[in-house]
Interface confidence: low
């Protein structure tokens, strides 16, 4: 049997494989996989790992072929590659395969984690960074604060995480985050677990602050008493000297 033989990388350079509307979609969406060759091709093949023959093929006299996956199901998710060829390359010879495209078909994305960097306890003057980490790249991340309806911050990230910076003075509070695909049809993740950000040593700070007030008041009382004692003492010394019989 003739099986695909892959030539050296420089010989037939790899094509590019992309997905429309996205690589992450909900079930039932129509997905188009686009394979673009660096030169005019004749046949394009869409491959899944371990398959000898193409899953789908398209014959086009150009650099671009489109593979239509109608009303996708979770089972159609997974790794895809595409190759291109021309008949004069000989039996079974394809180009180098494209980079893997991971297609994810799901109702909901996995829950992200939310952590504080360097930690969830902040000093009055220090900033804190919150990292919302999912499992997928090129997602949009949203940070929420408890008690505030609108998103606090919004980030698009090429990495599978996004960092949100909070100013120290405003940092304390309860936070959560989620992420979603950057364009329609949107696929959302579950909300993260909540994260509580608090003041550094907030209990002893309150105690000290109270004590300072008390010490201040005590100081004022002492100063007042001292003033009165001094006033009284000076009054007594003057009278005898000043009174004549």
């Amino acid at each position: 049997d003739i099986t695909p033989s892959v030539p050296p990388a420089s010989y037939h350079p790899k094509p590019w494989l992309g997905a429309q509307p996205a690589t992450v979609v909900t079930p039932g969406v129509n997905v188009t996989l686009r394979c673009r060759a660096p030169q005019p091709a004749w046949r394009f093949g869409l491959f899944k790992p371990g398959e000898i023959a193409p899953l789908l093929f398209r014959d086009v006299s150009s650099e671009l072929a489109e593979f239509f996956l109608e009303e996708v199901t979770p089972a159609q998710g997974g790794s895809y590659r595409c190759c291109y060829r021309r008949p004069d390359w000989g039996p079974g010879v394809w180009s180098q395969p494209s980079d893997v495209l991971e297609l994810l078909v799901t109702e909901e994305l996995p829950r992200p984690s939310l952590v504080a960097l360097p930690g969830p306890v902040v000093g009055p003057g220090a900033n804190v960074s919150l990292r919302c980490a999912g499992r997928l790249r090129n997602m949009s991340f949203v940070l929420y604060r408890e008690g505030v309806a609108a998103p606090l911050q919004y980030r698009h990230s090429a990495q599978p995480w996004a960092d949100f910076t909070l100013l120290g003075a405003r940092a304390p509070g309860t936070y959560s985050c989620y992420y979603h695909t950057p364009s329609a049809p949107y696929v959302l993740s579950q909300r993260s677990e909540v994260l509580v950000i608090s003041w550094e040593d907030s209990g002893s700070s309150d105690y000290t602050r109270g004590n300072l007030v008390r010490l201040g008041l005590a100081g004022l009382v002492l100063i007042s008493l001292g003033a009165l004692v001094t006033f009284d003492w000076r009054s007594q010394n003057r009278a005898p000297a000043g009174i004549r019989p």
């Epitope: 023959a53 086009v60 060829r85 008949p87 004069d88 039996p91």
Partner: antibody, heavy 120, light 107 residues
Framework: QVQLQQSGAELVRPGTSVKVSCKAS????????IEWVKKRPGQGLEWIGV????????NYNEKFENKATLTADKSSSTAYMQLSSLTSDDSAVYFC?????????????WGQGTLVTVSA | DIQMTQSPASLSVSVGETVTITCRAS??????LAWYQQKQGKSPQLLVY???NLADGVPSRFSGSGSGTQFSLKINSLQPEDFGSYYC?????????FGGGTKLEIK
């Protein structure tokens, strides 16, 4: 050796349908495309379409898109072409062919042909 | 669709002669062309693929040439078994159309 054995001649009524079979042997059926070609008396060859027996994927000549339906049964290594709503224009010899290489090009192996005659 | 124009439509020649059949594509098809021979009541047989490559078992008196839009099939020293019809076919974008054919007859 590679062989494609087609079903026998068919005499059918206009408006009906017919299913032509093409049994493959001598190679891994799912690794090569099966093509279908029409030859009318005194006329040239016309390419109808191709099926990937492994995935069931098909490509049709637009002219035959509403006329021919290509299928394949992996268990019996047989490819089928169903022709529907037959008219006298469908009277022809129909050939199945296997590509030279696994992904489909150059019709290297041919069946013996199936004569379909549409007549009232 | 790409149109394949084959000429001549028919040719009457004697055994031992050399003939050339041409095929013109309506647009550039690079080297994506095949030649077939078909005898009366028989299946077509692949002669040449990728414009110039001789298929297995095909005698060396057959040769294919050309690329782009102009192609030709040359048969040197015609033998009695070479008479029949010849077709070109492109493989550059579906549908894969055939030329109208050239009928080669004995003079």
């Amino acid at each position: 050796q590679v062989q494609l054995q087609q079903s026998g001649a068919e005499l059918v009524r206009p408006g009906t349908s017919v299913k032509v079979s093409c049994k493959a042997s001598g190679y891994a059926f799912t690794n090569y495309m099966i093509e279908w070609v029409k030859k009318r008396p005194g006329q040239g060859l016309e390419w109808i379409g191709v099926i990937n027996p492994g995935s069931g994927g098909t490509n049709y000549n637009e002219k035959f898109e509403n006329k021919a339906t290509l299928t394949a049964d992996k268990s019996s290594s047989t490819a089928y072409m169903q022709l529907s709503s037959l008219t006298s224009d469908d009277s022809a010899v129909y050939f199945c062919a296997r590509s030279l290489d696994f992904d489909g090009a150059w019709f290297a192996y041919w069946g013996q042909g199936t004569l379909v005659t549409v007549s009232a | 669709d790409i149109q394949m124009t084959q000429s001549p439509a028919s040719l009457s020649v004697s055994v031992g002669e050399t003939v050339t059949i041409t095929c013109r594509a309506s647009e550039k098809i690079y080297s994506n062309l095949a030649w077939y021979q078909q005898k009366q009541g028989k299946s077509p047989q692949l002669l040449v693929y990728a414009a110039t490559n001789l298929a297995d078992g095909v005698p060396s008196r057959f040769s294919g040439s050309g690329s782009g839009t102009q192609f030709s099939l040359k048969i040197n020293s015609l033998q009695p078994e070479d008479f029949g019809s010849y077709y070109c076919q492109h493989f550059w974008g579906i549908p894969w159309t055939f030329g109208g054919g050239t009928k080669l007859e004995i003079k």
